[in-house]
């Protein structure tokens, strides 16, 4: 094959080599960029900056080598468009620092920075940590800071990510209230801070206020959906990023739903209860308190992390005719009480049938369901205890 006269020449099926002295000052308009998996650049003294726009369109890039060139600055977001990058060699350039943000989100198996005039500061604390933890092949490079000695020896006592404190209201929050949250940010070299509110959706109207070091957030006209939702404050400095999540508990009355009994491995009377604080539950059978035993007891499903509603079963193990009757679930919290009832028939009474009739075996539960979801104030009803005497 004839020698390639261009600044950059194909290398293999999806590689590109740019080694002609001083031919590049940026990486715009590289030929066949969208399919490149490997890019090798050498001896490019005029290539001093690597920025987001330089690598746009290189979505398939796996290996990037820029060596013996003039690289002085790599933007924190330079590799945003190259999420598959796994090997990055920037050795023998003019880099004094490299932000932690540059490599965040990448799964780098190899990062080579030897031969750069690195300046030891807290901004390289992340790289020092990689060296300590044996990541990316960094320890083998024995990185030096220009005129300061080994990177490994850099003092790091004062190199911490920001410290965050989020203040939430002490008092009970009710549906329709406005809630003010404040995030206090402390630390050196603060760069950015903000709120992450992705979970909130329609749970409240959001208004942000203030800036570093004190960020305010007003959640107006809150709904009960706000419960179990994370409100996250974040802040960044040259060392890294910190996040703190809080949840606002919005009080609302107990509610309850009962469903027709179903036969599984055992019988189950399905229920759903909601309320904040979580309501206490009490079962009645034909109007009398039902004490739970190994034959009849409440089982909860695993709760969803982001909602207050609890689903479960009144589990009945091999129920007989003596278990036929009216089941009522009472749910109560300080803001109200609700109840729901359902008739269940598990088996005919073997002692009550006409001798001329066929012998009954069993039949499905009667489908009678009455639910009163509206809370009723009954302060004298106390939640039941969990320890009962028998005998």
């Amino acid at each position: 094959a004839a020698p390639c006269p261009d600044a950059c020449c194909p290398h293999g099926s999806s590689g590109l080599r740019c080694t002609r002295d001083g031919a590049l000052d940026s990486l715009h308009h590289l030929p066949g960029a969208e399919n490149l998996t490997e890019l090798y650049i050498e001896n490019q003294q005029h290539l001093q900056h690597l920025e987001l726009r330089d690598l746009r369109g290189l979505g398939e890039l796996r290996n990037l080598t820029i060596v013996k060139s003039g690289l002085r600055f790599v933007a924190p977001d330079a590799f945003h468009f190259t999420p598959r990058l796994s090997r990055l060699n920037l050795s023998f350039n003019a880099l004094e620092s490299l932000s932690w943000k540059t490599v965040q989100g990448l799964s780098l198996q190899e990062l080579v920075l030897s031969g750069n005039p690195l300046h030891c500061s807290c901004a390289l604390r992340w790289l020092q940590r990689w060296e300590e933890e044996g990541l990316g092949g960094v320890p083998e490079q024995k990185l030096q800071c220009h005129g300061q000695g080994p990177l490994a020896h850099m003092p790091n006592a004062s190199c911490g990510v920001p410290t965050l404190k989020v203040q939430v209201p002490n008092a009970s929050v009710d549906v329709g209230d406005d809630v003010l949250l404040r995030c206090q940010v402390e630390g050196r070299g603060l760069e950015q801070a903000g709120w992450i509110l992705t979970e909130l959706e329609q749970s409240a109207t959001v208004m942000k206020s203030g800036g570093l070091p004190s960020l305010g957030l007003t959640l107006a006209n809150v709904t009960s959906d706000l419960n179990r939702k994370n409100v996250t404050c974040w802040a960044e400095n040259d060392v890294g990023r910190a996040e703190v999540s809080v949840q606002v508990n919005v009080s609302f009355p107990a509610s309850v739903q009962l469903h027709t009994a179903v036969e599984m491995h055992h019988w189950c009377i399905p229920f759903s209860v909601d309320g904040q604080p979580a309501p206490s539950l009490r079962w009645l059978f034909n109007g009398s308190v039902l004490n739970e035993t190994s034959f009849i007891f409440t089982e909860f499903l695993e709760p969803a992390a982001n909602e207050t509603v609890r689903h479960g079963c009144l589990r009945l193990n091999q129920p007989t005719h003596v278990n036929n009757g009216n089941y009522t679930l009472l749910a109560a919290n300080p803001f109200g009480q609700a109840s729901a009832s359902i008739m269940a028939a598990f088996m005919d009474n073997p002692f009550e049938f006409n001798p001329e009739d066929p012998i009954p075996v069993s039949f499905s539960p009667v489908d009678t369901n009455s639910t009163s979801g509206d809370p009723v104030e009954k302060k004298d009803e106390t939640p039941f205890g969990v320890s009962v005497a028998v005998g």
Partner: antibody
Framework: QVQLQQSGAELMKPGASVKISCKTT????????IEWVKQRPGHGLEWLGE????????NYNENFRGKATFTADTSSNTAYVQLSSLTSEDSAVYFC??????????WGAGTTVTVSS | QAVVTQESALTTSPGETVTLTCRSS?????????ANWVQEKPDHLFTGLIG???NRPPGVPARFSGSLIGDKAALTITGAQTEDEAIYFC?????????FGGGTKLTVL
């Protein structure tokens, strides 16, 4: 495979308390009731009560209320019974059993408690 | 509290069928008593044989069966074997607690 491993034999003084453990393996501890049973020669088997570890629901046989206290540690999958104010009447072998109604279930090997001055 | 009564001892021969019974002081034993039968062998080795009157858990030989006979719960061993020599306890459920019978010592010779 469901297994219940009980703690070793205990020799106690009258008036003392003893705590017997029942470590379970092979199933989801929090979801099944644990029964406690006492066996004394000449007195057969007596049911002390039951506990549902995941919810802390406890049912005591009235004859043993105040004598036996059931607890459970879901982090170690272990159930406990504490017997207080021991007398010679409490000398017995104590069993835990995992119940899966209507089956009384899988039994531990028993813990012998001897009360003697 | 209810009293559960069993035969104190029974003797059978290998291959024979033997029935152990269990009576309740409160009246007829019903399916709501969830009669269980538990076998005790030497060194406090307990095994559940029957639960809920007539349910056999996995691993229990088919020669063991449970039923209600008249007003009593019954355990029948069809084709007894020498290894069935043991004490058999009946356990009945009374709404919120279990009561054990005194046990039947079964000898197979």
């Amino acid at each position: 495979q469901v297994q219940l491993q009980q703690s070793g034999a205990e020799l106690m003084k009258p008036g003392a308390s003893v705590k017997i453990s029942c470590k379970t393996t092979g199933y989801r501890f929090s979801s099944y009731w644990i029964e406690w049973v006492k066996q004394r020669p000449g007195h057969g088997l007596e049911w002390l009560g039951e506990i549902l570890p995941g919810r802390g629901i406890i049912n005591y046989n009235e004859n043993f209320r105040g004598k036996a206290t059931f607890t459970a540690d879901t982090s170690s999958n272990t159930a406990y019974v504490q017997l207080s104010s021991l007398t010679s009447e409490d000398s017995a072998v104590y069993f835990c059993a995992r119940t899966d109604p209507p089956y009384f279930g899988v039994w531990g090997a028993g813990t012998t408690v001897t009360v003697s001055s | 509290q209810a009293v559960v009564t069993q035969e104190s001892a029974l003797t059978t021969s290998p291959g024979e069928t033997v029935t152990l019974t269990c009576r309740s002081s409160t009246g007829a034993v019903t399916i709501s008593n969830y009669a269980n039968w538990v076998q005790e062998k030497p060194d406090h080795l307990f095994t559940g044989l029957i639960g809920g009157t007539n349910n056999r858990p996995p691993g229990v030989p088919a020669r063991f069966s449970g039923s209600l006979i008249g007003d009593k719960a019954a355990l029948t061993i069809t084709g007894a074997q020498t290894e069935d020599e043991a004490i058999y306890f009946c356990v009945l459920w009374y709404s919120n607690h279990w009561v054990f019978g005194g046990g039947t010592k079964l000898t197979v010779l």
